[in-house]
Every structure is written in C-alpha cells, then in structure tokens.
C-alpha cells in the first residue's frame, strides 16, 4: 500500500452510550466544614485516584470523609468491591475505550491519554484542546482504571469488580453490601460548588448531589468548575436526572429520568474531553 492510500483512511466518529458513575461522594472535594476542630480524616482525591489525608473541622462537610485510610479505600478505590457486581460476563470496558484517539480540530498541544485497542494499553497523545471524543483522559492512571485490563488475566471493570478471564467467574474483592444507586448525570453534577478565583459576586446555582437539589451560590466570575448554572431551571435540566436504583438479580428500577438520550450522550462527551 502506498503512503497516499494509508493517508486517506479516515477515522469516523461513533455513537456512544452514557457513562455510568458510582458513589457520587467519592467525587466531592475534601470539605473541612465551618468548624475549627483539627481532626485527621481521609478523603478520595479524584485527580490522583487515591485516598489522602486532610484536616476536618468537626462539623458539616460532606460524605467524602473517612475515619481511616482503609475505610476510604474500601468505599472509593478500585481494590474495593463496594460496587455493583455485574451479572453479565462480557467484556466490561466502556465503548469509548475502543475509539481511535482524536486530537480534535483545535491545536493546543495538551498531553492526554487514550486507550489503544491494538496494543491494549493506555498511551499518551497530543490533544488539541477542543472537541475530540471520550477516549481522552487527563491522567494515565484514569485511563488505566477505566480502559485497561487488570493484572493476572483479570479484567477490571469500571466498578472495581474483577472478571477472571480464565474461568469467567466474578471475583469480588469484599463482602460488603454493594451501593444501591448509580448516578447517571454528567460528572460535574457530583462536584461541590466552586467560587473560583476572581472577586465578583455573581448569583449562580449548583447541583448538590447529597440532597439532590439545585442550590444558589456566589460565583467569583472566573475559574471554578462546570457545576455552575445561571438559573435553577438550567441546573435542574442538566443534573436532576435522578438516580437508578438497583434491586437484586441485577434488575433496575428507574426512579426519575427526564432528559432525552442524545442530550445525555453529549453531556458525557464533555466529561473527558473538557476537564482541563
């Protein structure tokens, strides 16, 4: 084959299902609360994907707070099977792991990671800074957690349950009761309100995933995160999709889901592509 022929192999886009997220509190930032005690606690850091120490003030805060490192790991890291044990025995990678890396139409030379289905490994690539697809991770660790196979022939799925490639048996890591809910909204709906770094006092709304409601907060005018809406209605539209409750035998009960499927898909495309 000539180089010209190879050059004209055009990589096309693919429709993707929504990404399912578990344990919303593991995505919260460490919150020391308004009180002034000095208490050593642990929280799960979504950026390093590890449990880390922080100082808790003794009141309020959020659910991403644990008495011990072990408890934090049990609840939030992939070694823990405090997650749903899937009933299916098929491969557990999300569909977007099989997309080609896509730098997007901009050119910003941002280092990102994608899962290469040929090499079966996460690899570095240069992301342009806009658009692209969901096979796009800020860290190698994040890419590996979601798309790579685990050690010893085990496939580690998104929820931490291991699938033994030899005898197709599910191997949970713990006997703790699994979480009963999956959050199906955009990932930023799980993050706490973030004022940002500037000095303005703009009236905004954020989704409080602990209470399941949109609440007002004061935005500084720059920075912050995507859990930031100009109206309560917009906040509810984006985040109040409800939870899906699991029952035994892997069944699902839908509790509330308002938005159309395609809109949800778009929201998920944004999760990986844009958290810079």
């Amino acid at each position: 084959d000539s180089e010209e022929d190879e050059e004209h192999t055009i990589i096309t886009d693919t429709e993707l299902p929504p990404l399912k997220l578990m344990h919303s509190f593991c995505a919260f930032k460490a919150d020391d609360g308004p009180c002034k005690a000095i208490m050593k606690r642990f929280f799960f850091n979504i950026f390093t994907r590890q449990c880390e120490e922080f100082i808790y003030g003794g009141c309020e805060g959020n659910q991403n707070r644990f008495e011990s490192l072990e408890e934090c790991k049990k609840m939030c890291t992939r070694d823990n099977a405090n997650r749903i044990i899937k009933t299916t025995l098929q491969q557990e990678k999300p569909d977007f792991c099989f997309l080609e890396e896509d730098p997007g139409i901009c050119r910003g030379y941002i280092t990102r990671y994608f899962y290469n289905n040929q090499t079966k490994q996460c690899e570095r690539f240069k992301y342009g800074g806009c658009l692209g697809n969901m096979n796009n991770f800020e860290t190698l660790e994040e890419c590996k957690n979601i798309c790579e196979d685990g050690p010893n022939g085990f496939q580690v799925d998104n929820y931490g349950t291991q699938l033994n490639a030899v005898n197709n048996s599910l191997t949970p890591q713990s006997t703790k009761v699994p979480s009963l809910f999956e959050f199906h909204g955009p990932s930023w709906c799980l993050t706490p309100a973030d004022r940002g770094l500037c000095r303005a006092n703009e009236n905004r709304f954020y989704y409080n995933s602990v209470i399941g409601k949109c609440r007002p907060f004061k935005y500084s005018g720059c920075g912050g995160n995507e859990n930031n809406f100009t109206s309560k209605q917009e906040c509810l539209r984006a985040c109040k999709k409800g939870f899906i409750q699991r029952i035994s035998k892997g069944g699902l009960i839908k509790t509330k889901r308002k938005r159309k499927k395609q809109r949800v898909k778009i929201a998920y495309e944004e999760i990986f592509v844009k958290n810079m």
Partner: antibody, heavy 123, light 112 residues
Framework: QVQLQQSGPGLVKPSQTLSLTCAIS??????????WSWIRQSPGRGLEWLGI?????????RYAVSVKSRITINPDTSKNQFSLQLNSVTPEDTAVYYC?????????????WGQGTLVTVSS | DIVMTQSPLSLPVTPGEPASISCRSS???????????LNWYLQKPGQSPQLLIY???NRASGVPDRFSGSGSGTDFTLKISRVEAEDVGVYYC?????????FGQGTKVEIK
C-alpha cells in the same frame, strides 16, 4: 492569503447526489493546523454545519447527525482540494453551500470561506 | 445539540452610536485554559461570513477594535462601540463546545 474556490452544479434532481469541490490555495488540505468543513445556509435553517475533515497523524472526520447517513467529505491531496457528496437529496437540501477552513492554531474559528454555491434541488 | 439563541433578531442602528447583540447557549460553553468555545461572524450583504471574534473575546486579524466580545457560561455579548455604515449585515454566534457545531439564527444590523 488563503483562498477557497468552490465548484459544482447549481441544480440537482431529487434522489440524486449533490457533489461540490473546494479548491484550496495558500494552504494545504493536509495541514495539521487546519480543518476543512462544509456549511450550508438556507432561509429556513440559517447556517447549518454539515461536517469537517482534518489531518493530524491520520485523517479524521465528523458529520452532523442530520446528514450523517448521506454525507461524505473527502480530501484530495494531489489536487489540494476537498469535496462534499450528499446522497439522496430532497428539496429540503436546497441551500447556499459554503466550504470553510477552520483555523486550528491560535485562532480557533472558520477564518476563510468559499464564495458559496447556490444548489437547488428540483426536478 | 447545543441551541444558540440570539437577540434581537433585528437591530436598527445609528452610525456613531453603540450596538449590542446577545447570544445565549442552551448549555454552558466550557471555559478551558482561558478559552470560551464561542465565535462571532459577520455576513455582509451578498458575501460569505467572516470571522470577527474567536474564543469569546479575541478579535480576528483585520477586525477593527470597535468590535468586542464578552461573556462566559451561557451568556455572551458582541458590542460595537461606534457603529459605522460598513458594519451592516447579519451577525452570527457559533459554538464549538460539542458536536454538531451550531450557529445562532443571526441578528440583522441595519442603519436606521
């Protein structure tokens, strides 16, 4: 100075294929600092983005869902141009079709446009 | 799809006076490394559109400094500090936050 020169028929019969070409001067279709797009404009729909191609380590494309099953955008590196093919056209596809360059470097946007081609779909 | 809504749809202006066009997106156009995924274009009568403002607030080359873009999240504004006769035409906002790329329906600026 980048220039985009469009060519192709102005009249297409329903159910046939609309084919337009955009010749590029002052840049390369294979440039890694550009992307190449087709956009159409009609009174009913306003400006409607149809699709885009771009070359980085390989060629990529993206198409609007509204035309995805009917559209193909291809580069022609030997002639430094790219083309639009829209199959199974209906009168709804009547519009002015523009090719445009997306500037991928510092200035992210459609910074150069072709002159536009009015395509009428009618028997 | 992200829906871009412009207002007003028609804007009669007096030369030398300021003018302002609003563009609202149905989803937040994410700030990323200081970038807003929104552009403004002007289509003069009988011509193809031309890029005016990129990344929300940056003037494209050759665009006079009387044009300025601002806004973040879902609300954006294009301002002309002093309208000139050559500024007449239809102004469009466009997002590139997610596919498909979408444009506003346009604001027609004409001299009173």
């Amino acid at each position: 100075q980048v220039q985009l020169q469009q060519s192709g028929p102005g009249l297409v019969k329903p159910s046939q294929t609309l084919s337009l070409t955009c010749a590029i001067s002052g840049d390369s279709v294979s440039s890694d600092s550009a992307a190449w797009s087709w956009i159409r404009q009609s009174p009913g729909r306003g400006l409607e983005w149809l699709g885009i191609i771009y070359k980085r380590s390989k060629w990529y494309n993206r198409y609007a869902v509204s035309v995805k099953s009917r559209i193909t955008i291809n580069p022609d590196t030997s002639k430094n141009q790219f083309s639009l093919q829209l199959n199974s056209v209906t009168p709804e596809d009547t519009a002015v079709y523009y090719c445009a360059r997306w500037h991928s470097d510092k200035m992210w946007g459609f910074d150069d446009w072709g002159q536009g081609t009015l395509v009428t779909v009618s028997s | 799809d992200i829906v871009m809504t412009q207002s007003p749809l028609s804007l009669p202006v007096t030369p030398g006076e300021p003018a302002s066009i609003s563009c609202r997106s149905s989803q937040s156009l994410v700030f990323s490394r200081g970038n807003t995924y929104l552009n403004w274009y002007l289509q003069k009568p009988g011509q193809s559109p031309q890029l005016l403002i990129y990344k929300g607030s940056n003037r494209a080359s050759g665009v006079p400094d009387r044009f300025s873009g601002s806004g973040s999240g879902t609300d954006f504004t294009l301002k002309i500090s002093r309208v000139e006769a050559e500024d007449v035409g239809v102004y469009y906002c466009q997002q590139y936050d997610s596919y498909p790329l979408t444009f506003g329906q346009g604001t027609k600026v004409e001299i009173k």
